[in-house]
Amino acid sequence: TLNSVLNSNAIKNLPPPLGGAAGHPGSAVSAAPGILYPGGNKYQTIDNYQPYPCAEDEECGTDEYCASPTRGGDAGVQICLACRKRRKRCMRHAMCCPGNYCKNGICVSSDQNHFRGEIEETITESFGNDHSTLDGYSRRTTLSSKMYHTKGQEGSVCLRSSDCASGLCCARHFWSKICKPVLKEGQVCTKHRRKGSHGLEIFQRCYCGEGLSCRIQKDHHQASNSSRLHTCQRH
């Protein structure tokens, strides 16, 4: 369960804490490639890669979904798998890569006036970390949003990127997900070096926008692995 994945407070894969971000020496802040919260996941190492176990899609990255690694495999053993690109087979929306949804068993572009009708989802925040509303009211939240003509604006709670308006994706913000802007050219992006090494990002970034990919910044090739800065660049 997500609860068991979130039972540790260690933060991994962070940039150097002092002296600014790679490529920005002396700045008073560091640009972190995503603030990570790995949870108590013994599989999660970079050098000794193993698949990232999961119980539901929301535990995986924005470009992954949760499923059994083999067709007809043991449903009790699920890992985060790479999302399916356009025109690939699917069984549900979460299997399709951001910007797509599952229609008639095939991943198709969500640009084609796809609206999910109504989301009725109850989130009970019973993780290892305490969640309190600032005004002290109930911690049980019901999302009920009609999606016929309006999609989530920036900062709106979402379940997946298809819930967000154009130019936004659904990304983790603490232990929820909200609509954030898709990254533009030159913006810092998160490059997970090996699938499963990323943990759960507390402050997750969106993916790079159309025609862009997340690549190491050219002038950072000499930097150490841990401090390399990735940015959205033209293909």
């Epitope: 560091s30 640009a31 600032l134 913000h173 929820s176 954030k180 402050f203």
Partner: nanobody
Framework: EVQLVESGGGLVQAGGSLRLSCAAS????????MGWFRQAPGKEREFVAG????????YYADSVKGRFTISGDNAKNTVYLQMNSLKPEDTAIYYC??????????WGQGTQVTVSS
């Protein structure tokens, strides 16, 4: 350019209190929320507490629940961490970080908190 500056750290006896502040300057865009993290010598950085302006919620690690309180003012770009009933194991460098709408995640340089027994 955004700068996050932490202050309020120091040496305190076990059972004592400290109040940390983190001020953001140079921001021309909004923040979704801010968090406090800490790193003790030889250990990994860990989440301590967070506040979401967007969702109106606060978050705490189990180890500090009931002892630490996070608060802040988004309009003033400031977040605070009130630390009571401090323990020697709270000794660490405390960092604040911000979830920014320009897609950067900003870190401060940290403030040292030392709790003596």
């Amino acid at each position: 350019e955004v700068q996050l500056v932490e202050s309020g750290g120091g040496l305190v006896q076990a059972g004592g209190s400290l109040r940390l502040s983190c001020a953001a300057s140079g921001r021309t865009f909004s923040s979704y929320g801010m968090g406090w993290f800490r790193q003790a010598p030889g250990k990994e950085r860990e989440f301590v507490a967070g506040i979401s302006w967007t969702l109106g919620r606060t978050y705490y690690a189990d180890s500090v629940k009931g002892r630490f309180t996070i608060s802040g003012d988004n309009a003033k770009n400031t977040v605070y961490l009130q630390m009571n009933s401090l323990k020697p194991e709270d000794t660490a460098i405390y960092y604040c970080a911000s979830d920014e709408s320009d897609a950067y995640n900003y870190w401060g340089q940290g403030t040292q908190v030392t709790v003596s027994s």
